[in-house]
Amino acid sequence: DAEFRHDSGYEVHHQKLVFFAEDVGSNKGAIIGLMVGGVVIA
């Protein structure tokens, strides 16, 4: 059987990013996203 390992040789850093909702619409409050490897994914 083939064995698959996730071992890319480098660390993928993640960081929480916070945006204000009113910058992108009419809502108030904060939008919290997660940036992984330079891409905002959530």
Partner: nanobody
Framework: EVQLLESGGGLVQPGGSLRLSCAAS????????MGWFRQAPGKGREFVAA????????YYADSVKGRFTISRDNSKNAVYLQMNSLRPEDTAIYYC?????????????????WGQGTLVTVSS
């Protein structure tokens, strides 16, 4: 770009309060989300709080939530940080910053204008 000048720092006992002010010059003040960061001796600059362009929305670091309140007065081009229940670990230089709309408000790289900072020392 706006120019920023902080004031209101000083020496306060644990459990005490201080109100920091940040005066902004420039006609584009309400195009910017405004934030406070702090830098303790030997440490990096960390996010404290931010307020949206309108003043309606705010966001706080977990370490200050419930103790600090950020606000702004667009008619006076000013931002404020009311700090209550101060602790020794709040000792730092506090910086006011301006971040253009749509950028992440909790990270230093979003801020393109900074004041010179005001020192807050919490000690008995």
């Amino acid at each position: 770009e706006v120019q920023l000048l902080e004031s209101g720092g000083g020496l306060v006992q644990p459990g005490g309060s201080l109100r920091l002010s940040c005066a902004a010059s420039g006609r584009t003040f309400n195009n910017y989300n405004m934030g406070w960061f702090r830098q303790a001796p030997g440490k990096g600059r960390e996010f404290v709080a931010a307020v949206s362009r309108s003043g309606v929305s705010t966001y706080y670091a977990d370490s200050v939530k419930g103790r600090f309140t950020i606000s702004r007065d667009n008619s006076k081009n000013a931002v404020y940080l009311q700090m209550n229940s101060l602790r020794p670990e709040d000792t730092a230089i506090y910086y006011c910053g301006a971040a253009y709309r749509g950028t992440a408000i909790n990270v230093r790289r979003s801020y393109d204008s900074w004041g010179q900072g005001t020192l807050v020392t919490v000690s008995s």
